[in-house]
């Protein structure tokens, strides 16, 4: 591969790239050296090579773009403008490339870019405005309709001194640019709480995926704004109980399936409105596998197969009848 | 022990072409990117260029963009810089440099530079 | 661009006394995960010479008397006890983004 490139300067919102041109007219189809292209297929993969930068001379037809299993570490801003712009870039993958700072306005200047995968990278440092490219209040419109963001989560050691939860949820939120998300992944991200402010402003979204995170209630989140949503994975979580405001909205969902395996249950009195619930409705997917956790009594007991007898509190005794 | 040489350096005139060579030893070249940084006499450093390790990436600063070419040859251990269009104030001596990656890298090895001169 | 601007142009210190270069960039260069800041010396006739890396890492090999600090947009390269064999000009130089730049750099000399 030769020194040229189709890169050019957006020096505003790109200065990144502000510099990449050379001396020769770009060759805009040309294969990066490290890559792989198939101009059939519109795809191009730098998969596993070590690349620390995003290559330069990205042919123009590029729709599907592999660059997983690189050392990328950051993505600055414009990283992906081009001159002409990479118009045709539909779905992107950068899993596994261990990003830990993706800058403001990084995937500016793909007007098509519908599926964006960044999962498997330690992003200790996500900016609000990866994703809408701006800090107006009210962005231009995201092209993303799938977005997966599962495992980016950073080592302990390396998270900021901030909530990981609250980073991620300010760039999916940022001037309402991914009003059309319709995908959205978060497995295996630690979460401890969704904040109750973000399913409200993705009302596009059909599939969402919160498995594998540490989930412990769900009772300040609203699903009523999801007419949309499909699927709901919360396996894998630290569930107790739902209650029966969430019961209530799950079930007015018309196109809902919900996943709910290996969570901790708690068989107890607060459990008598989900088992009713569980008994009567279809929208959860392998109803029939769901196990109490505790109290060590009801452990291994099938939800579907209890009763209210099963399901009692031990009493709360008056202080002065309480022993140490 | 991590050596780089420049070449290539000369006097040339104005609106001719030069190009430079930094020969690396000592060190796996095609693991690194490489860079070019420029000295005029008596003035401060100023980056030129960057290419990646596996020339997958390249980058140029406004003041050489269109003229200069940067390269390399991971065969031969070689880094290169095509300079056309030479101009008066390209007067400078001419440094390699290498770099574990672009922007969270840094320049951790320098060859002892080559003398470009453009004079009519 | 980021400009990047040294201070004070030049410096004489005496020999064992502490010697502080100060260096300012025209926005932040710093990120919660790491600082783009970088510091060289530069002696007579020589290619210059890494120095310190991210703002306050100590490159290999040198004297443990240099070190740094600041982040953001104010940084400091500080020689706790100056030796005759510091007197160099020193730049300090940022990767935040293209094109990197140098400060104009800063001569030390011995009072």
């Known amino acids: 591969s030769s020194p040229t490139s189709s890169a050019s300067s957006f020096s505003s919102s790109a200065p990144f790239l502000a510099s990449a041109v050379s001396a020769q007219p770009p060759l805009p189809d040309q294969c990066p050296a490290l890559c792989e292209c198939s101009e059939a297929a519109r795809t191009v993969k730098c998969v596993n090579r070590n690349l620390t930068e995003v290559p330069t001379d990205l042919p123009a037809y590029v729709r599907n773009l592999f660059l997983t299993g690189n050392q990328l570490a950051v993505l600055p801003a414009g990283a992906f403008a081009r001159r002409p712009p990479l118009a045709e870039l539909a779905a992107l993958n950068l899993s596994g490339s261990r990003l830990d700072e993706v800058r403001a306005g990084a995937f500016e200047h793909l007007p098509s870019l519908r599926q964006l995968d960044l999962s498997h990278n330690p992003l200790a440092d996500l900016s609000p405005f990866a994703f809408s490219g701006s800090n107006a209040s009210v962005s231009a419109p995201s092209p993303l309709v799938e977005l997966i963001l599962n495992h980016i989560v950073p080592p302990e050691d390396e998270r900021q001194n901030r909530s990981f939860e609250g980073m991620v949820v300010a760039a999916l939120l940022a001037g309402r640019a991914l009003q059309g998300l319709r995908r959205l992944e978060l497995a295996s991200n630690h979460f401890l709480y969704l904040p109750r402010d973000v399913l409200a402003q993705l009302p596009s979204l059909r599939h969402l995926d919160l498995s594998n995170n540490s989930l412990v209630s769900l009772t300040y989140v609203s699903f009523r704004n999801l007419t949309h949503l499909e699927s709901l994975h919360l396996e894998d979580n630290a569930l107790k109980v739902l209650h029966n405001g969430t019961l209530a909205e799950l079930q007015g969902l018309p196109h809902i399936r919900v996943f709910l395996d290996n969570n901790p249950w708690v068989c107890d009195c607060h459990m008598a409105d989900m088992v009713t619930w569980l008994k009567e409705t279809e929208v959860v997917q392998g109803k029939d596998r769901l196990t109490c956790a505790y109290p060590e009594k009801m452990r291994n007991r099938v939800l579907l197969e209890l009763n209210s007898a099963d399901l009692d509190c031990d009493p709360i005794l008056p202080p002065s009848l309480q022993t140490s | 022990e991590v050596q780089l040489v420049e070449s290539g350096g000369g006097v040339v005139q104005p609106g001719r072409s030069l190009r430079l060579s930094c020969a690396a030893s000592g060190f796996t070249f095609s693991n690194f990117g490489m860079h070019w940084v420029r000295q005029a006499p008596g003035k401060g450093l100023e980056w030129v260029a960057y290419?990646?390790?596996?020339?997958?990436?390249?980058y140029y600063a406004d003041t050489v963009k269109g003229r200069f070419t940067i390269s390399r040859d991971n065969s031969k251990n070689t880094l290169y810089l095509q300079m056309n269009s030479l101009r008066a104030e390209d007067t400078a001596v001419y440094y390699c440099s290498r770099t574990n990656s672009l922007l969270r890298g840094f320049f951790d090895a320098w060859g002892q530079g080559t003398t470009v001169t453009v004079s009519s | 661009d980021i400009v990047m601007t040294q201070s004070p142009d030049s410096l004489a210190v005496s020999l064992g006394e502490r010697a502080t270069i100060n260096c300012r960039a025209s926005?932040?260069?710093?990120?919660?995960?790491?600082?783009?800041l970088h510091w060289y010396q530069q002696k007579p006739g020589q290619p210059p010479k890494l120095l310190i890396y991210s703002a306050s890492n100590l490159e290999s090999g040198v004297p443990d008397r240099f070190s740094g600090s600041g982040s953001g947009t104010d940084f400091t390269l500080t020689i706790s006890s100056l030796q005759a064999e510091d007197v160099a000009v020193y730049y300090c130089?940022?990767?935040?983004?293209?094109?990197?730049?140098f400060g104009q750099g800063t001569k030390l000399e011995i009072k």
């Open positions: 290419i990646s390790s596996g020339s997958t990436s390249f």
């Open positions: 130089q940022h990767s935040w983004e293209i094109p990197l730049t």
């Open positions: 926005q932040s260069v710093s990120s919660s995960s790491y600082t783009y």
